[in-house]
Structure formats: C-alpha cells, structure tokens
C-alpha cells in the first residue's frame, strides 16, 4: 500500500529537489497540531500566534482576548492556566527542565478582574508543581519537596507536609523512577472532583542506591549529579498515599489510605489514583513482580474522618502469560453510578479490550472484541463511550476513534474517523470538552497532519483548527520518499514493516538498506503517521531504503506477540529484525553487501545485539545511548519484563543478554557507539562497559560522547549527532560526499 506517492512528473522534475540534512536539522518541514485548552462544554482557550490568550466560544462563534501578550511578556511567561472560577490566571516562567516530565518554574498570579498581579503572599520560587483546584481558585503547589495549599491566591499558604527533603522524601511529586517508569507525570497529587479533598503520594527514597555522574559545566571542578535510582533488583522507593480535607486542612490533617493486604505482604508499587466522587477514590497497586495488580475503591467515613477500602471493592487483575497490562496497567473510567467502570485488559483470546466491571472482574462484560486492540478510552458520557483502536482494515499501526452507544441496547458502534479523510488520515487522537459536547480530532498522518473541531452529538465537522497549509506549500517542490506499510508472515508470526523508498525507486536496481529499530516491549514503530525526518532525507537524497519492523514484544497485536519476550529480552526482538532483513533481500532490490542497522535507547541495545549476532548480514551499525546490561537499568521497567536478577529467579538470562558478552562478534562489523555523559535514564555506564569489553577483546570500533547531554541529545548536539551518523553511514555504503 503506497501511502505517500511522490509527486514527480517529467515537467516538474527540474523544479523538484531532494531533502537535505539541513532541512531536517532546521525543522523546515515540521508540522503543527491544535489541542484546545477546554474550559467548559463549549469554550476553549488558545494562545494566538502573537501570544495573546484568546477564549473561543464555539456556540456563539465569538472569540476574545482574556490576557494580552503584553502581560505575558511582562513576566516572560511561556505557559498559563486559568482558574476554574475564571478569576485568575497563573503565568509560568523561568522554565527549568529536570527529567522527562519534571521541571521547575516561577509562577505569578494575575487577577483578571482588576488587570493586576496578585501582590502579597507571593509564591516562592522555584516551584516544582502547581495546579488549581477543579472548582474555584484554590492552589496546591510543591516547593522543596513539600506540599502547600492556598484557599485563594492572595492568602497565606497552609503547609500540608513537613518531611520533604531533596533526594530523600518526595511529597506530591514523583522520584526519578516513578516519574519515568510508573506515573509518566511530573506530579503525584490529585484534587477530588469538587476540590474538597487533595490526595498525594509520599515517596521515601532513603534506602535507594544513588547513581552519581559528573556534570562538567565550565567550572574548574565538575559537579556530581546524585539521583536515587533503583536498578534491577535494588531497594525500591517506599510509597504512601495520603488524603487531606482542603476545607479544614488543620482539623484532622492528612489521612493515609490503606494498602490492600495482598499487595502489602511484599514489595509493591502504587500505579495510579482516580477520583470517582468527592468522597470516593480509586487506587491502583502493583506487586513488585508485576503480574498482579489490585484496583481498590475507597470511601470516606465521615464519622472517623478516614478512608475505608473494603475487600469487596478490591478488583484483581493478573497475567499468567506475561506482566499485568501493556506498558502500564490501564486506568479505570468510571460511569455515572460512581461504582461501575470501564477498563482495558486482555480478553480470553489475549487481545486488549474494553470491559465493563459492575461487581467483580470475573463478571466483567466485554464491550469490544476481535483480533485487534482497544487502545484508549477517551470519554464516557451518559449515552456514549469514545475510544480508539486499530481495528479498521486490520492495520495495527492505525488509530481510529469510535463511539459506542451505551445508552441503548444492544450497544451500537460507529467509527467516527474511518472515512473522514481516508487517504490523508489514518492515525488519530482526540480531545473532548466537558460532557463531550464538542471534541477536537488531531490526525497525525500518513498525510500532512490536520486538526479539526467536531460536534459531540452529530460528529459533524465544525471547522478546521490547523491544516498546515504552509507545510503543504513548502513540500510542493520536494521529492519525498515513497512509504509503504506491509506485512511478512514468518513461522506463524506476522511482522509488520514500513519501508521508505527513494523517490525514483526502481525494483530492478539494488539499494543500500538501513534498518531503524526500537523494538522495546509494548512499543510500536510501524505507524501510519507523517514524518519528514533524518531517514526521509537518507531515502530522498542519499538513495537508501529504510525499513522499520515490529517484531515480537511489540504492541497492539495481541498478547502472544507482546508477551513472547517475557523474561528473555534481547532474543526474539533481534531474531525478528534479522528474519525481516533476509526477507527484504529476497525481494531483489537490496544490495546485500550494504546493510546497516541503527537504534536509540532500547533500539541501541537491539542494534548492538543484531550487529553481534554473527549472521554476517550487517556491514555496519550505530547504537545511540544503548542499554548494555539489564542489571544497569531501572527496576520498575526492567523487572516488569525480566523478573529479578537473582539466582532463584532470572539472573542467568540477565547475564546472557548483555552486549558485553558478545564483544568478540563485533570484529567483522563497523560499529559506532554514541552516548551522552549526563544521561540520567540510560546511564553512560552502559556504553562505558561496551567500550571496555570491546577494548579488552581488542575489537576496533568508533565512538562519540556528548558532554553534559542527557538521553535526548538535544540542542546543538542533535545537529552534530545526525551529521556524524550521516558521514558514518555514507562511508559504510561507499556513497560520495
């Protein structure tokens, strides 16, 4: 299936040009999306091109400025947040990135009634997290690992926690491992629906081993960065959940929510919190051996001012073939009765589907079914449930939005997006207003992305929010590569692949092949999305064929494929890349003397193992910030898929699956190893150990480090990185510069 045909005709040939590396590094062909900042059923805020904050009313067609760019500029604000009572706006400035999601910032509160900043009892700086209550204009914020509450922006703060300590006790914000591997947020506090209660997590990292690395900066002596970071098998953070009444915070103080007995009996994690009503909350817990998850519904007991979590309201989710959930355990979406809920988990055939749980998980009613997967539940209203799946036309790498009418019997299903812009749009997400009165659809491809606004009752398109016209015009004279998404059937395994082909691709010719791999558990690389990136340039200008393959361990094609890698990472992911390469050679247009593989992070691990597989298939390859041994990576992630590195569990495979164990096998390939020295995620240690093993084996290789750069290798390092990798590949493929 050719998704993006090249627009080359003889008459145009001399005006058309190939992509350049400069195009990619400058972001010349980047696209825009439009996500409304919903403030009601029919209103949203948006930051205009000239930086005014504008309110749009869909029903009246009006739009008006609520905050001028002058006010924004006066404090150098880069972000804002309107209080639910519409009286105040917080303005965020001095953004300072910490880890993937976390950052600190300075916050100013602007009073919209008088057009002035709130003076007196100003917020301290820098703040780690700040948010409005869902009703009114209470503020909760985290400063120096402690939580504070303000009833009104101008009021003095009430301090909720006192034990917060850098790198030791975290209140209302996650520690490193919870941020990256469990919550995927910068916050760990949750307001109840009407702002009566505030729930928060406390993480105790006192006993966690610390990763320490040098940050060189430009001082005489480097700084040492210390992060409590539990590697596989190490001591983990201890988590506790508390809830405080924000109306009378001093009256009873924070009340701890009890952990289910079956969870508390051994090491465990807290995985998410969902408020149901102001007096009912749902907590999800996970055993350290991550195949058992417990969902616990707790109720406020007015008489005791405590939270009660009866055993009858505990729902267990267990996997016998792998780990619980997909990447994370899914979260519940509660219905209007405030006790039953909808949740995605594996059905009896091993496909993730939506289930309706009224009393017990055993009696769950399956809402969706088929040899495809439900991916996200966006919204449940009185009469509709909106979700995304990859059902349409049996392409796992697509995402369409569906509506199930739950108000009628039997429930009827309608695909909202399948036929809207069928060629252009096959990968959607959505953003819903209150009560799903309206929603925005954001289409990511395969054509140029487009964002549209729709009526929540009729699904009618109201207007285009962003169609990337400038990008469309800019691409008119560019020879883009062709892209196709197809599948290989090998030994009862389906391997979906995306192939990116040079603009004048000719099947009778031979082309160098570059495999781009990620391959991590529950990931997906073969997606019907638009991208003009480095590999687009390599196909367009340098005449390479690039392929991405989703092998065993990847997501959204059922548990058989997903859980195939359970307890044995580094085996089947690599095998499936190699199998695909052999199939590509059989297609007849690949020069088998010029095949390379590259990947980043988990992809760097897979590419390293593929190069060291001893097949002789690969001439060269690149590993960027690779994992080299699972003993070096984070406990929460690693143990989910590998179990523990102990003799009586899975130590043997931990040892067998390292890159270092295969050092000898790099002798006959050209290997480029790249890592940032300040990588807080996949520590530089990983590449240091690969390099040491290669040196000890007297194997030649190339390497590049990026001083003081983290896992993302951003800024000027990005330009240097892609330039360096381009030279390496062109040399490997004997392409002239």
């Amino acid at each position: 299936i050719v998704l993006r045909p090249s627009r080359v005709h003889n008459s145009e040939e001399n005006t058309m040009r190939a992509l350049t590396l400069k195009d990619i590094l400058n972001g010349t062909f980047s696209y825009k999306t439009f996500f409304p900042n919903w403030i009601s059923g029919q209103e949203y805020l948006h930051q205009s091109a000239d930086n005014n904050i504008v309110l749009y009313n869909i029903e009246t067609g009006q739009s008006y400025t609520i905050l001028s760019n002058r006010t924004m500029k006066s404090v150098n604000a880069s972000n804002y947040g309107l209080s639910p009572d519409r009286q105040f706006v917080y303005l965020e400035s001095d953004y300072s990135k910490l880890w993937r999601y976390s950052y600190t910032a300075t916050y100013y509160i602007y009073d919209l009634s008088n057009g002035e900043f709130v003076r007196g009892n100003e917020l301290p700086r820098p703040i780690q997290y700040l948010c409005w209550s869902p009703v009114g204009s209470k503020l909760a914020y985290v400063y120096q690992n402690n939580i504070y509450l303000k009833q009104r922006p101008g009021d003095p703060p009430f301090q909720i926690t006192f034990n917060g300590r850098e790198n030791k006790i975290f209140n209302g914000i996650p520690d490193w491992v919870y941020e990256e591997e469990m919550l995927a947020t910068k916050y760990a506090l949750w307001w109840s629906p009407n702002g009566k209660f505030l729930a928060y997590a406390e993480f105790n990292d006192t006993d966690i081993p610390v990763i320490a690395y040098s940050y060189y900066g430009d001082e005489q002596y480097p700084r040492t960065i210390n992060i409590p970071y539990p590697k596989a098998g190490a001591k983990n953070p201890v988590v506790r959940i508390f809830i405080i009444d924000t109306t009378y915070p001093a009256y009873v103080g924070p009340q701890e929510v009890p952990v289910p007995a079956m969870i508390a009996s051994s090491d465990y994690y807290f995985s998410w919190l969902t408020w149901v009503t102001d007096e009912r909350v749902c907590l999800q817990w996970l055993k350290r051996v991550q195949n058992v998850s417990v969902l616990s519904i707790c109720d406020f007991r007015e008489d005791w001012q405590t939270w009660d979590c009866p055993k009858t309201q505990e729902h267990i989710e267990e996997s016998r073939t792998g780990w619980a959930g997909g990447f994370f355990v899914s979260t519940p979406v509660f219905s209007y009765d405030a006790i039953s809920y909808y949740k995605i988990f594996s059905d009896k055939d091993g496909y993730k589907h939506i289930h309706y749980i009224k009393d017990t998980v055993e009696n769950a009613i399956q809402i969706t079914s088929g040899k495809w997967e439900a991916i996200n539940i966006f919204r449940v209203t009185q009469d509709s449930l909106f979700y995304s799946s990859n059902e349409f036309e049996e392409y796992p790498g697509r995402r369409n939005i569906y509506r199930i009418s739950i108000g009628s019997y039997p429930p009827s299903k309608k695909c909202v997006t399948c036929h809207l812009r069928k060629e252009r749009c096959q990968y959607y997400t959505a953003s819903f207003s209150d009560y799903a009165k309206y929603y925005a659809l954001v289409c990511y491809g395969p054509g140029i992305p487009i964002s549209t606004l729709h009526d929540g009752r009729t699904d009618q398109e109201i207007k285009i929010l962003e169609e990337n016209k400038e990008l469309e015009n800019a691409l008119k004279n560019i020879q883009l590569p062709k892209e196709e998404i197809k599948k290989l059937e090998v030994d009862e395994i389906t391997l979906w692949y995306k192939m990116i082909l040079p603009p004048q691709f000719d099947r009778s010719k031979k082309y160098p092949l570059l495999i781009q791999v990620y391959g991590g558990p529950c990931s997906q690389s073969v997606r019907s999305v638009f991208a003009v990136n480095w590999i687009s340039y390599l196909a367009s200008k340098e005449g390479m064929v690039i392929a991405l393959v989703d092998g065993r361990g990847t997501a959204f094609q059922g548990d058989k494929l997903l859980y195939a890698v359970y307890r044995k990472l580094g085996v089947y992911e690599v095998e499936d890349q190699i199998t695909a390469v052999r199939k590509f050679i059989e297609m007849g247009f690949i020069d088998e003397k010029r095949i390379a593989i590259w990947g980043w992070s988990y992809g760097g691990y897979v590419s390293s193992l593929a190069l060291a597989s001893g097949t002789g298939l690969f001439k060269c390859g690149i590993a960027v910030a690779p994992v080299s041994s699972w003993e070096y990576y984070a406990s929460v992630y690693t143990e989910r898929f590998m179990g523990l590195p102990t003799k009586d569990d899975n130590l043997e495979h931990y040892k067998n699956s390292t890159v270092m164990a295969r050092a000898e096998y790099f002798r006959n390939v050209d290997y480029l190893l790249i890592h940032g020295t300040a990588d807080d995620n996949v520590h530089f240690q990983n590449s240091a150990q690969i390099a040491k093993a290669l040196v000890n084996a007297q194997v030649d290789f190339q390497a590049m480090w990026y001083s003081d750069q983290n896992h993302g290798l951003s800024g000027l390092s990005t330009n240097h990185l892609y330039t360096h990798m381009t030279h390496f590949l062109k040399q490997c493929f004997s392409l002239s510069d």
């Epitope: 059923g41 009313n57 009246t60 009006q62 008006y64 609520i66 057009g115």
Partner: nanobody, 115 residues
Framework: QVQLQESGGGLVQAGGSLRLSCAAS????????MGWYRQAPGKRREWVAT???????NYADSVKARFTISRDNAKNTVYLQMNSLKPEDTAVYYC?????????WGQGTQVTVSS
C-alpha cells in the same frame, strides 16, 4: 461589537436591597458565562459573582447568601439581586463576560450604601 449596559444602582440604606441589571447586545447571549464585578473607592476591582451557561452560580465569600445572580435568556439580561446591603458594598458595579474581556469595561453603575 460587544456591548454591556449596567443599570439599577443608587443610594440605599444599610440593610436595604437593590437589583442591578446588565443588558447585553452584540453577540453576547445565554451561551456566555457572565460575571458581576465591583470597584470600591480607592480599591482594586474585584469579582462578585458568576453565572454559567447552564445556570450554575458562584459567589465571592463577602457576598455569599446576600447576593443572587440570575439571568433572563429571553431578554438577554443578567441580574444581581443585592440584599442586606452593607456600607462596604459601596462601589461601582460592572458586568462583563467571565473571564472578562481584556481591557473592555463599561461605565458601570454606582451603588452607595449609607450607614
């Protein structure tokens, strides 16, 4: 062009009542969230009350249980019923959208409460 006309102010004794009206024209109607605001002499303008499109109301602590905001969708008018008035309620009262339109305030209506 958005136009909001406040009326109904006046001089009243402490403990008395007044009913303010805000007539909306242009594209403003029941599909907008509306608010009443006030500015006392020598003080900053402050929010008083809000009514949403669905009729949900919200009040400043200082006026709770004394003031009532309402709307008549047919007449495109928003009201503020003020009971048990106090001298500290003396101010110029304005109506606007909520959140208010940036830099767009009418003349307001003066309310004076004598002791």
């Amino acid at each position: 062009q958005v136009q909001l006309q406040e009326s109904g102010g006046g001089l009243v004794q402490a403990g008395g009542s007044l009913r303010l009206s805000c007539a909306a024209s242009g594209s403003i109607d029941s599909r907008n969230t509306m608010g009443w605001y006030r500015q006392a002499p020598g003080k900053r303008r402050e929010w008083v009350a809000t009514i949403t499109t669905g009729g949900r109301t919200n009040y400043a602590d200082s006026v709770k249980a004394r003031f009532t905001i309402s709307r008549d969708n047919a007449k495109n008018t928003v009201y503020l019923q003020m009971n048990s008035l106090k001298p500290e309620d003396t101010a110029v009262y304005y109506c606007n959208l909520a959140p208010p339109i940036f830099n767009s305030w009418g003349q307001g209506t003066q309310v004076t409460v004598s002791s």
